[in-house]
Amino acid sequence: SERCDDWGLDTMRQIQVFEDEPARIKCPLFEHFLKFNYSTAHSAGLTLIWYWTRQDRDLEEPINFRLPENRISKEKDVLWFRPTLLNDTGNYTCMLRNTTYCSKVAFPLEVVQKDSCFNSPMKLPVHKLYIEYGIQRITCPNVDGYFPSSVKPTITWYMGCYKIQNFNNVIPEGMNLSFLIALISNNGNYTCVVTYPENGRTFHLTRTLTVKVVGSPGGGSGKPIPNPLLGLDSTGLNDIFEAQKIEWHEHHHHHH
């Protein structure tokens, strides 16, 4: 075949996804390597081709887009898994070409398993909260594009193994989790489980991030914004929170 601009294996994009969950993976060419987008390329008569190399194999092979229930499909510059399987792990290549032009890049995809407390080999994003700085929020990450705005998903938030409910200072609000006043005891891993329907099937997305409570911006105590729990000094609130956590450990261990 004619020469192709090969950007090699883009290890900066080590994509990790959970087993048995939907995954949408954009071809990195348009995001990081080329100066034009998919629509422009498509209008110019360029075709996007996908193939892959299985884990521990050298052979490049086409992706099977004829699986039952269209488990793997391509939509514009996105490769869809509905859902992933463990043996989808491998290096994926997207190639943009026509008779006179060719450019391609490969990237690794790792399908990982989670345990009953959402622990996994997944590398977790870290979200910093400022200690005692008033209301701050985290948002369930990387769920855009999985379902249209007309679909209203259900969301459950967890801290570690524990469903977040009746926490003193942490309030689930759909895709957001609000910290009324961030305390050191709020350090930990937070998981959102998003459930949504699509074409007569139900899918689940699991997203975990690490919350790190740090000193206020600019040093000092910062200036807390008005807050419904201001009447409770932070140590008192912390005592309540710790006592509740002990109670949850006794009554709701490994709550799913």
């Epitope: 087993e19 398993q113 259900t154 967890y158 469903k163 409910q165 459930t195 009554h251 709550h255």
Partner: antibody, heavy 119, light 107 residues
Framework: QVQLQQSGAELARPGASVKFSCKAS????????MQWVKQRPGQGLEWIGT????????RYTQKFKGKATLTADKSSSTAYMQLSGLASEDSAVYYC????????????WGAGTTVTVSS | DIKMTQSPSSMYASLGERVTITCKAS??????LSWFLQKPGKSPKTLIY???RLVDGVPSRFSGGGSGQDYSLTISSLEYEDLGIYYC?????????FGSGTKLEIK
């Protein structure tokens, strides 16, 4: 499609133990919880417990601790429930049901296994 | 344990009629509630989860609602295949607990 196939009816003596199965197909067995539910003849539903086959983590309702033991075999995608020290009140239909974290904890149910305890 | 009080325990209704069944929890269950239908000799079928979400394949005449401690299941226009026993389940906390059931029969 997702299916849970439960093993056939069991007849057991008082004091004996019985172990029955729930074979999963059509989905990734290790990614979902398996729930177990008891229904005595003419009575309502009673939750026994749950297991996450991915790591074997279990939860039981207090009443069934020591009575029911939940296990899972990943290689065969099969969940098991063992009942020990059988008594007449253990005569019932036992259902397995698949569930996920948080939102949809019961979606697909097995057809049930009938256990009869009789001397 | 959270106690789920379901009412009525049995009811008669005509085909085409609007039917409502209620479930009251002994404490706030944060919409972690499912509804099931069990027909004689069959395993239960999940209808609704998280109080108001219809399971795929369940007819749209079924709807759920409620919050806090009080929840309801409504059938907008009763059909023959809807007859059976309806159960609610709370899964807000362990142990999960079912309501005692509502037997729905033809008037």
């Amino acid at each position: 499609q997702v299916q849970l196939q439960q093993s056939g009816a069991e007849l057991a003596r008082p004091g004996a133990s019985v172990k029955f199965s729930c074979k999963a197909s059509g989905y990734t067995f290790t990614s979902y919880w398996m729930q177990w539910v008891k229904q005595r003849p003419g009575q309502g539903l009673e939750w026994i417990g749950t297991i996450y086959p991915g790591d074997g983590n279990t939860r039981y309702t207090q009443k069934f601790k020591g009575k029911a033991t939940l296990t899972a075999d990943k290689s065969s995608s099969t969940a098991y429930m063992q009942l020990s020290g059988l008594a007449s009140e253990d005569s019932a239909v036992y259902y397995c049901a698949r569930g996920y974290f948080g939102n949809l904890v019961f979606d697909v149910w097995g057809a049930g296994t009938t256990v009869t305890v009789s001397s | 344990d959270i106690k789920m009080t379901q009412s009525p325990s049995s009811m008669y209704a005509s085909l085409g009629e609007r039917v409502t069944i209620t479930c009251k929890a002994s404490q706030d269950i944060n919409t972690y509630l499912s509804w099931f239908l069990q027909k004689p000799g069959k395993s239960p079928k999940t209808l609704i989860y998280r109080a108001d979400r219809l399971v795929d394949g369940v007819p749209s005449r079924f709807s759920g609602g409620g919050s806090g401690q009080d929840y309801s299941l409504t059938i907008s226009s009763l059909e023959y295949e809807d007859l059976g026993i309806y159960y609610c389940l709370q899964y807000d906390e362990f142990p999960y607990t079912f309501g005692s059931g509502t037997k729905l029969e033809i008037k």
